[in-house]
Amino acid sequence: IWELKKDVYVVELDWYPDAPGEMVVLTCDTPEEDGITWTLDQSSEVLGSGKTLTIQVKEFGDAGQYTCHKGGEVLSHSLLLLHKKEDGIWSTDILKDQKEPKNKTFLRCEAKNYSGRFTCWWLTTISTDLTFSVKSSRGSSDPQGVTCGAATLSAERVRGDNKEYEYSVECQEDSACPAAEESLPIEVMVDAVHKLKYENYTSSFFIRDIIKPDPPKNLQLKPLKNSRQVEVSWEYPDTWSTPHSYFSLTFCVQVQGKSKREKKDRVFTDKTSATVICRKNASISVRAQDRYYSSSWSEWASVPCS
Amino acid sequence: RNLPVATPDPGMFPCLHHSQNLLRAVSNMLQKARQTLEFYPCTSEEIDHEDITKDKTSTVEACLPLELTKNESCLNSRETSFITNGSCLASRKTSFMMALCLSSIYEDLKMYQVEFKTMNAKLLMDPKRQIFLDQNMLAVIDELMQALNFNSETVPQKSSLEEPDFYKTKIKLCILLHAFRIRAVTIDRVMSYLNAS
């Protein structure tokens, strides 16, 4: 058993039917010695008397808010949450596995640049009685500071019969140098509590591996005289690290017909312009990627050919 | 990915082309190592990230773009003191810091070259003959060093009398390639920045 926060405790249980459970001793936070009784949640049934209460915790019915009283007055509370260990693996019932880029990916994180700012998000089908708390650091043995905001509900979507809820959090490394070569990963820890169930999720990554630039901006077409060709031009996104000659991007330019089945023409360039043939009803899209370290491509920025 | 390869203009900063080749070569070698050593801990998540140049060179600090020198987090250890002149500085008014930067890059390359050659000698003794260093990568390191053209003491190749542990050597190869790839990215960024300056 360990303390999650004041008066909130997590009991770690080997979780299988008929498992022996854990014996827990609760102590009433009071100088009083006599006439103390204990109750659980809203029930008035007295579970025991005395300054300490010993309980065998085996299932969720044994968890909840234990209260010690004296003569009708509440002395203190202890909320017991359960953390299930199924066959030696901590349970992951609260969050959905996003399965990208691999199984058991519960947290996904992205950074728009090398400033040390990043966003993480996760999914759940649970809509009520749910709280999250997020901590982060650079490295784990001698952790360096990363400050995270509060997790917020950022999207809701319907998936088949279920509603899916997306939560996200923004974090910022306290003293980040964009040019630094990372040797210690960023660690992100999310505590999730649903009713009386506690779970924790972690992700470990280097900022360089989660870079996903914003799409190129100011995408423009300039028709070339006496030709079906156009000059496409664009700019680095505002959110990208500077100077751009050091933090260079490479670009992919795509000409896509109206029909998804039509052949796509693609050109790769390090410049911020390209000459392409603009077909009728086609659209031109450009996306960006770090020129030197192949992390994710940005989303496409698009303009119609007409 | 199949990006078109840029061919440098004759007047272009002479080292840019070599640094691009270096990054391509080390990335290919790392990919080959990951595939060949699939049952070894060779991915970025599995390895310890060690930098063999730590406390010996300070390329990141010495080569920091001017725009980032205002960022205090980037200025924690700028006390290296290499100074010399190399051919990459040809016909340019170069600052002390630029000379320091290129000299630091040269020292990095020299250290990695020694490590890779020592490791290759061990890998050639492996009866499994599972993986060897790409000669192209070693050649590209050499070419960039020559382009930098710094006068420096030659570091003798390490030789070991004990029987090599091939498992450990292959894991060390992965660690070294990951670190060298990160340094090659920095070198490429620096050369691109200097070329634009």
Epitope: Y16, P17, D18, F60, D87, G88, D93, T124, T125, I126 | -
Partner: antibody, heavy 112, light 107 residues
Amino acid sequence: EVQLVESGGGLVQPGGSLRLSCAASGFTFSDYGMVWVRQAPGKGLEWVGSISSGSSNIYYADTVKGRFTISRDDSKNSLYLQMNSLKTEDTAVYYCARNPYWGQGTTVTVSS
Amino acid sequence: DIQMTQSPSSLSASVGDRVTITCKASQNVGTNVAWYQQKPEKAPKSLIYSASHRYSGVPSRFSGSGSGTDFTLTISSLQPEDFATYYCQQYNSYPLTFGGGTKVEIK
């Protein structure tokens, strides 16, 4: 007493469908993840798929992905395995399990 | 996918013998390994989880050990009811995979 009882097995033609059920009792079913495991005649054990408590996470073996669907109805203390596009190689005894408890198994035969 | 290679595939032993079955994972699986016992025409029985933890009710003569890639199930003194087929399983990553089984027969 903890019990897991499978049902719904039988003979089916290739390409056909079958729905297996597993009735659980003796424990708080909704609080536990469940698995399906199968065993072809004379062969070893093969994991088919798993479902977490609350159905938030469901995983399948590559051999059945896209053809089999695992679901649960906590109000009925029941686990299900919907099997579509059955192949002869799906012939096996199917067990539902929640360590350390296993059902007795139900036999599925896919044959023309 | 992680392969679990069990050895031997079969062995003959006498009552009272100490029996050791090994299982090798193709990749590091930590301690996320379970062992099962199965008798002909019966459902498997769970013995060990987390490489070395016995489920309640499993006799103490069964013990498991190992971590990473090498795991062992030991029966310290073979009893008549222990003649069966034993399977190891990794549950470190999906898909979950079983070893091919070890048949323990009477000598």
